[in-house]
């Protein structure tokens, strides 16, 4: 251990061995539980790179290996042999080596060993009998440890090589620092002037120039605290460690989208054990006090089909926001903690009961000191207007799902929009939520004129009378008649009926549909083929050109390797060939061979293909 | 591992209750041990998104809440009440609700409950005496969805009626997709065949053409999982969403310097909630490469990469042209039986 590691051992810490010699705390591997690939071997290395000075001198090193149907883990810790561990007594605590013994645990294979020489739980030894149960071996795919990454400091070199010697400005040898090193852990540190790390692992930093770092992060889901060693010459989380020379770990906020992010670094032993958020330390930002915190304003509900977001102003400068929401009779629930956004998605709260009236409020806190309060002894906040989703959510733009003509009647169907309101674990549609309160208005008109007619329905279907042989266009609007505001949606996109022409026109229309389908399917693939493309088809050569297009289409089918593309291409070729053969055996002369055509990318190929199909439609 | 949710009950699973009625296996929350924020409340939701059909009909639902100096965990499992669990008998197995009772465990606070109604271990109830420091209680800590359940358990059929299904002119389903959408979050998913996203936000994608995407990244510092909606016509993270039509989110590794990067896309509701690292993709042997490709008459090939799944093209020699309808593509693929990589045979014909 480097000389400075004498941890100013207080009298009450002094423990002696049987000979009366002072017993110093043991050095053990201490990585808690990590995934492991150790299986079916006589011995394994722990792959734990954290060497810790055990807290109490009486503690020994322990390793626990567990295997169940899902995975293998290896746990490395310090533990007091007077106390059981995992309900078992550490019988072998005095052993210099960590010899694994199997213990009875239902539903898993469980081995444990303990030992009392430095880092003795780095090499765990299984008795030979064990290695029978799985003769096929197999290592697994790596986990933590130096095999599988994770944010683990490199293995502690205990022999300090010359090239590790670093001196400070006075020329004195600079020994590696002792830092808390627990990587990322969940934390309960919130809204306090300072917190202890609750990290029990003290590590000797690998390089003498490394300092201690702590990173506190809070998002909608949880709070984490990360404790590590890091070289201040290198950025950490994309930020420079500006405060590396500080003896204390004074938290400063950094900009990270979607979360609140504080970081500090320091260079006294275990200085990242006590992280400080409080104002008196935060000298670098004199404006961050309460005086400059402004209350949110213009709180506005933005809600469509129950997707509900609260928006407010201003964009924060040196402050953060937390939103709370409640029903009139309920408790406040906090959302979007300490956010620098000016919006908060409250959908998951309001969909619990869309007929309730909700109130939200936005709290403003100084960025560096979320404990700070306003003059009245609590943080500044502003209330939102009341919001009743059922009465106020905007109706989203509807979509016409289909229309079908039978004689002089047309049935127009509106898509039942989905919402995020759940009942019995299924998502309800707009119709499910509103029932007969929701009606649709249909506007329809002849393609050839502008005079509109209208009809209403309190289902999602209209049955209207039309003139035979005329094409109509349709648009729908959702309405909730019982409302006084936000009664109507915007109009749906207009959908129009096509004109029926010729016996084989429908085939060609379906060919275009298939081409569109192919285009959609291949856009999610990477097909870089170039294909023979006739981009300027002369009507006298349209059949020849069509045959080239159909040939080249098979290349797309081949190269995609996709069954649905293959089926669509096959279907398209059948349709096209049916229509071509209906014209009899047309012989065209003076037309280009396929191979004489220019090669174009797939997008251009398909566009030209559509054009030639339209040529057939127009003449069918 | 909770058994795969299969709702077809085999004969050998049939058990009858005291009245002779067939007793079907119970549905329970089954997330094993997870960190929890449940503390000092009269009741909590489990925030476990996995609902499992218990393996044996006699099994009941169990929840175990433990608190020590470092953290709080909540364990949710199925268990046979004839057998002790954590060395304790499940005395309350017949209860329809999961009423927590404290048990003696040195060095920690330990509560356990069992119950026998479906998913009854999703809502765990602490007796009033326990809640001494905050007599006003407060509901569960909630989560996404309905009251804290997070994502929809995989076995839930979302009874999408025919009249909800919208088709475009090609008959393809067109309405907007439901996807998990939590952007980038830290993840503990590592070294598993599949993981749940643990994202409680289900979003209706903005555009009907959008699909669900999940991106798993691991570097020296941490692991993140990103869940979003995205239009497969546009690349995401510079990669094309080749698997957008897949109903499942099957992770494929992508090349990104300085990190391990996996991405998947899929087009069934909330399909990016369960991300699958299936063995064939889990680049267990990144060293597999193809031999030099075969020769094709009147064509040459310049191979840029011999690695697995590389796609290369032959080029017809000068004076020759690719015959229409033939493909110049060859791909380095793996023969699963022999574990040997080879180039596929192109259909290319080069003609004068």
């Amino acid at each position: 251990i480097p000389p400075h590691v004498q941890k100013s051992v207080n009298n009450d810490m002094i423990v002696t061995d049987n000979n009366g010699a002072v017993k110093f705390p043991q050095l053990c591997k201490f990585c808690d539980v990590r995934f492991s690939t150790c299986d079916n071997q006589k011995s394994c290395m722990s792959n734990c790179s954290i060497t810790s000075i055990c807290e109490k001198p009486q503690e020994v090193c322990v390793a626990v290996w567990r295997k169940n149907d899902e995975n293998i883990t290896l746990e490395t810790v310090c533990h007091d042999p007077k106390l059981p561990y995992h309900d078992f007594i550490l019988e072998d605590a005095a052993s210099p080596k960590c010899i694994m013994k199997e213990k009875k645990k239902p539903g898993e294979t469980f081995f444990m060993c303990s030992c009392s020489s430095d880092e003795c739980n780095d090499n765990i030894i299984f008795s030979e009998e064990y290695n029978t149960s799985n003769p096929d071996g197999g290592g697994g795919s790596g986990g933590g440890g130096s095999g599988g990454g994770g944010s683990i400091p490199p293995h502690v070199q205990k022999s300090v090589n010359n090239d590790m010697i670093v001196t400070d400005n006075n020329g004195a040898v600079k020994f590696p620092q002792l830092c808390k090193f627990c990587d990322v852990r969940f934390s309960t540190c919130d809204n306090q002037k300072s917190c202890m790390s609750n990290c029990s692992i003290t590590s000797i930093c690998e390089k003498p120039q490394e300092v201690c770092v702590a990173v506190w992060r809070k998002n909608d889901e949880n709070i984490t605290l990360e404790t590590v060693c890091h070289d201040p010459k290198l950025p950490y989380h994309d930020f420079i460690l500006e405060d590396a020379a500080s003896p204390k770990c004074i938290m400063k906020e950094k900009k990270k989208p979607g979360e609140t992010f504080f970081m500090c670094s320091c260079s006294s032993d275990e200085c990242n054990d006590n992280i400080i958020f409080s104002e008196e330390y935060n000298t670098s930002n004199p404006d961050s006090g309460t005086t400059n915190t402004v209350a949110a304003y213009n709180l506005t509900w933005k809600s469509t089909n129950f997707k509900t977001i609260l928006e407010w102003e201003p964009k924060p400068v040196n402050q953060v926001y937390t939103v709370q929401i409640s029903t009139k009779s309920g408790d406040w629930k906090s959302k979007c903690f300490y956010t620098t956004d000016t919006e908060c998605d409250l959908t998951d709260e309001i969909v619990k009961d869309v007929k309730q009236t909700y109130l939200a409020r936005v709290f403003s806190y100084p960025a560096g000191n979320v404990e700070s309060t306003g003059s009245a002894g609590e943080p500044l906040y502003e209330n939102s207007p009341e919001f009743t989703p059922y009465l106020e959510t905007n109706l989203g733009q509807p979509t016409i799902q289909s229309f079908e003509q039978v004689g002089t009647k047309v049935n127009v169907t509106v898509e039942d929009e989905r919402t995020l309101v759940r009942r019995n674990n299924t998502f309800l549609s707009l119709r499910d939520v509103f029932g007969k309160d929701l009606i649709y208005t249909l506007y329809y008109w002849k393609s050839s004129s502008s005079g509109k007619k209208t009809a209403k329905t309190n289902t999602n279907e209209f049955l209207i009378d039309v003139d035979k042989g005329e094409n109509y266009c349709f648009s729908v609007q959702a309405v909730i008649p019982s409302r006084t505001v936000n009664r109507k949606s915007t109009d749906s996109p207009v959908e129009c009926m096509g004109q029926e022409k010729g016996e084989f026109r429908e085939n060609w229309v379906n060919v275009i549909s298939d081409l569109k389908k192919i285009e959609d399917l291949i856009q999610s693939m990477h097909i870089d083929a170039t294909l023979y493309t006739e981009s300027d088809v002369h009507p006298s050569c349209k059949v020849t050109a069509m045959k080239c297009f159909l040939l080249e289409l098979q290349v797309i089918s081949l190269e995609s390797g996709d069954a649905s593309i293959h089926d669509t291409v096959e279907n398209l070729i059948i349709l096209a060939n049916n229509s071509l053969s209906s014209n009899g055996n047309v012989t065209e002369s003076g037309c280009k061979e396929c191979e004489e055509l220019e090669e174009k990318n797939i997008k251009e190929f398909l566009q030209s293909f559509v054009h030639i199909v339209q040529m057939f439609i127009n003449t069918s | 591992i909770p058994p795969h949710v299969q709702k077809s009950v085999n004969n050998d699973m049939i058990v009858t209750d005291n009245n002779g009625a067939v007793k079907f296996p119970q549905l329970c929350k089954f997330c094993d041990v997870r960190f929890s924020t449940c503390d000092n409340q009269k009741s909590c939701m489990s925030n476990c998104s996995i609902t499992s059909i218990c393996e044996k009909p006699q099994e009941v639902c169990v929840a175990v809440w433990r608190k020590n100096d470092e953290n709080i965990t909540l364990e949710t499992v199925c268990h046979d009440p004839k057998l002790p669990y954590h060395d304790f008998i499940l005395e309350d197995a017949a209860s329809p609700k999961c009423i927590m009772k404290e048990k003696k465990k040195p060095g920690e606070t330990f509560f356990m409950c069992s119950c026998s109604s479906d998913e009854c271990n999703d809502n765990i109830i602490f007796s009033e005496e326990y809640n001494t420091s905050n007599p006003d209680g407060g509901g569960g800590s909630g989560g996404g969805g309905s009251g804290g359940g997070g994502s929809i358990p995989p076995h839930v059929q979302k009874s999408v009626n025919n009249d909800m299904i919208v088709t475009d002119n090609n008959g393809a389903v067109k309405f907007p997709q439901l996807c998990k959408f939590c952007d980038v979050r830290f993840s503990t998913c590592d070294n598993q065949k599949s993981c749940m996203s643990n994202c409680s936000i289900t979003s209706i994608c903005e555009k009907p053409q959008e699909v669900c995407v999940a991106v798993w990244r691991k570097n020296d510092e941490n692991i993140t999982l990103e869940t979003v909606c995205h239009d497969p016509k546009l690349p995401y993270h510079d990669f094309i969403l080749e698997d957008a039509a897949s109903p499942k989110c099957i992770m494929k590794e992508k090349k990104k310097p300085g990190e391990t990067f996996f991405m998947c896309s899929c087009s069934s509701d909330e399909c990016n909630d369960n991300i699958i690292f299936s063995e064939e993709y889990n680049t267990s042997n990144p060293d597999i490469t193809c031999p030099p490709p075969m020769s094709v008459e009147h064509a040459d090939i310049w191979v840029k990469s011999y690695s697995l799944y590389s796609r290369e093209r032959y080029i017809c020699n000068s004076g020759f042209k690719r015959k229409a309808g033939t493909s110049s593509l060859t791909e380095c693929v793996l023969n699963k039986a022999t574990n040997v990589a080879h180039w596929t045979t192109p259909s290319l014909k080069c003609i004068r």
Epitope: T441, T454, K456, N458, I464, P481, K488, T490 | -
Partner: antibody, heavy 117, light 107 residues
Amino acid sequence: QIQLVQSGGEVKKPGASVRVSCKASGYSFTDYNVYWVRQSPGKGLEWIGYIDPYNGITIYDQNFKGKATLTVDKSTSTAYMELSSLRSEDTAVYFCARDVTTALDFWGQGTTVTVSS
Amino acid sequence: DIQMTQSPASLSASVGDRVTITCLASQTIDTWLAWYLQKPGKSPQLLIYAATNLADGVPSRFSGSGSGTDFSFTISSLQPEDFATYYCQQVYSSPFTFGQGTKLEIK
């Protein structure tokens, strides 16, 4: 309270045009369609057409196409109906009304248009 | 276009009488029907919407029934102020036609 206030009566010569206004107050103007209804002396009610102030869509009865033109000014919450090429048979009381989709719940007081040479 | 046939065209009754007016649609209109009352020199006033629903502030002696093509409107006990002309209107599809009216007079 909800009110629809119409402009005063007009006397016009045949062939002329007239513009009748209907000022709405007490509700969100763009949330409700405005209907126009005619009542000739001693006759029943005839539906002329409506306008949706939200999107500007107009629907007319076939008999009033080319006769009536419906417009709105959202800034003043006012609906207008212009009648062109007036003839003696256009002499009537013209009502505007608020449409709640299932019925007409509030009506203007009516505007009498007299066409006489 | 949907024709609305209202009957009777006129009706004499006394205070306290029960009176029923019917309205027949030329094609089905579900429940998209409204009833109005109009007094001489006044604007029409909404009584019933969606075939059966009483409008705000309308006394409960007025009621409506029917769906599809056959509708009726009833005043359970005539009051002096109820003598007026009554109209039905279909609001199902344009043109939104009115019945020709029923004039209710004092006997």
